[in-house]
C-alpha cells in the first residue's frame, strides 16, 4: 500500500522537517526558519510556537519538532503543552481569586501549588497525634495507646492553639 | 490596534523614584488585571507587581514590599508603577502586560515593549 500511495502521491516521500512544495514540482523543500513539521508527506509547516512574556523556552525549535516552553520563576505551568502560567505560592498557602492566601488553622500544604487540604486525623485510625500540624505540615500520627509498651504513655499534646494573631480565613 | 506603551523609565540615583505608566490603547483597561514585570541583563523574567480589575494588588517579588506600589486610573486607561528607595539591582527593562486576572497569564496576553529604569550613582 505504502509503495502504492507514494507512486500516486509524491508528497508521502517526504520526511519529517520538509515539506511538499505545489510551486516547484512537489519537491520535498526544507522548513523555513521558525517553522517545522513532526510527520512526513505535509503540504506545508507549522510556524513554531514562540515562548515569550512570562513562558520561557525549554526546548527550541527544531526542523521537525516545535518549540516547549515553561514559565518563569515564580510561576508553574498549568494546561496542555503549558497553555498557561499560573502564580506560585508559599508553602502554607493556597491560591484564591484574590491572590495568595494562608492556609486556614487545621489545613496545611507543602507545596508551591494546589489547595491546603485538613491535617489528618490521626484518631479515625486509633492513633495519636505524635507532632502538631502546622500550615506547612501535616500532623504526625504515633502508635495508638494499645501498641505501646507497659508503662509508656502516648505522646499526644494538647489540641495546638491558634497561631499568634492568625485568623481562619 | 490593541497595544500597551510604558514609559517613565530612565536613570536614577540608589535610593531615589520613578513612576512608570503603563496606557492601553484599543481595549478598555478596566476589563484587565495589569501586571509589571522586569528583566535584567542576563537574569530571568520576574513578576514584580500586579493589580487587578477591581483594584485588588498582588506582590509578586517580595524585594519590593514597601517601596514599590501600583495604581490605575480607569479614566485615563493607564496603571501606574511608583517605585521608591530604588537600588542598583532594581535595574531592569519593565513590562506591562494585561491578564484577565493576576494569578494566571497566557499566551495570548498583550505586552508592552518595556521602559528600561537604571539604578546608578
Known amino acids: 500500500f505504502e509503495r502504492t500511495r507514494s507512486l500516486q502521491d509524491p508528497c508521502s516521500n517526504c520526511p519529517a522537517g520538509t515539506f511538499c512544495d505545489n510551486n516547484r514540482n512537489q519537491i520535498c523543500s526544507p522548513c523555513p526558519p521558525n517553522s517545522f513539521s513532526s510527520a512526513g508527506g505535509q503540504r506545508t509547516c507549522d510556524i513554531c510556537r514562540q515562548c515569550k512574556g512570562v513562558f520561557r523556552t525549554r526546548k527550541e525549535c527544531s526542523s521537525t519538532s516545535n518549540a516547549e516552553c515553561d514559565c518563569t520563576p515564580g510561576f508553574h505551568c498549568l494546561g496542555a503543552g503549558c497553555s498557561m502560567c499560573e502564580q506560585d505560592c508559599k508553602q502554607g498557602q493556597e491560591l484564591t481569586k484574590k491572590g495568595c492566601k494562608d492556609c486556614c488553622f487545621g489545613t496545611f500544604n507543602d507545596q508551591k501549588r494546589g489547595i491546603c487540604r485538613p491535617w489528618t486525623n490521626c484518631s479515625l485510625d486509633g492513633k495519636s497525634v505524635l507532632v502538631n500540624g502546622t500550615k506547612e505540615r501535616d500532623v504526625v500520627c504515633g502508635p495508638s495507646p494499645a501498641d505501646l509498651s507497659p508503662g509508656a504513655s502516648s505522646v499526644t499534646p494538647p489540641a495546638p492553639a491558634r497561631e499568634p494573631g492568625h485568623s481562619p480565613q | 490596534q490593541l497595544q500597551l506603551v510604558e514609559s517613565g523609565g530612565g536613570l536614577v540615583q540608589p535610593g531615589g523614584s520613578l513612576r512608570l505608566s503603563c496606557a492601553a490603547s484599543g481595549f478598555t483597561l478596566a476589563d484587565y488585571a495589569i501586571g509589571w514585570f522586569r528583566q535584567a541583563p542576563g537574569k530571568e523574567r520576574e513578576g514584580v507587581l500586579c493589580i487587578s480589575s477591581s483594584g485588588d494588588v498582588t506582590i509578586y517579588a517580595d524585594s519590593v514590599k514597601g517601596r514599590f506600589t501600583i495604581s490605575r486610573d480607569n479614566a485615563k486607561n493607564t496603571v501606574y508603577l511608583q517605585m521608591n528607595s530604588l537600588k542598583p539591582e532594581d535595574t531592569a527593562v519593565y513590562y506591562c502586560?494585561?491578564?484577565?486576572?493576576?494569578?494566571?497569564?497566557?499566551?495570548?496576553?498583550?505586552w508592552g515593549q518595556g521602559t528600561q529604569v537604571t539604578v546608578s550613582s
Open positions: 502586560v494585561a491578564p484577565r486576572i493576576c494569578s494566571t497569564y497566557s499566551s495570548d496576553d498583550y
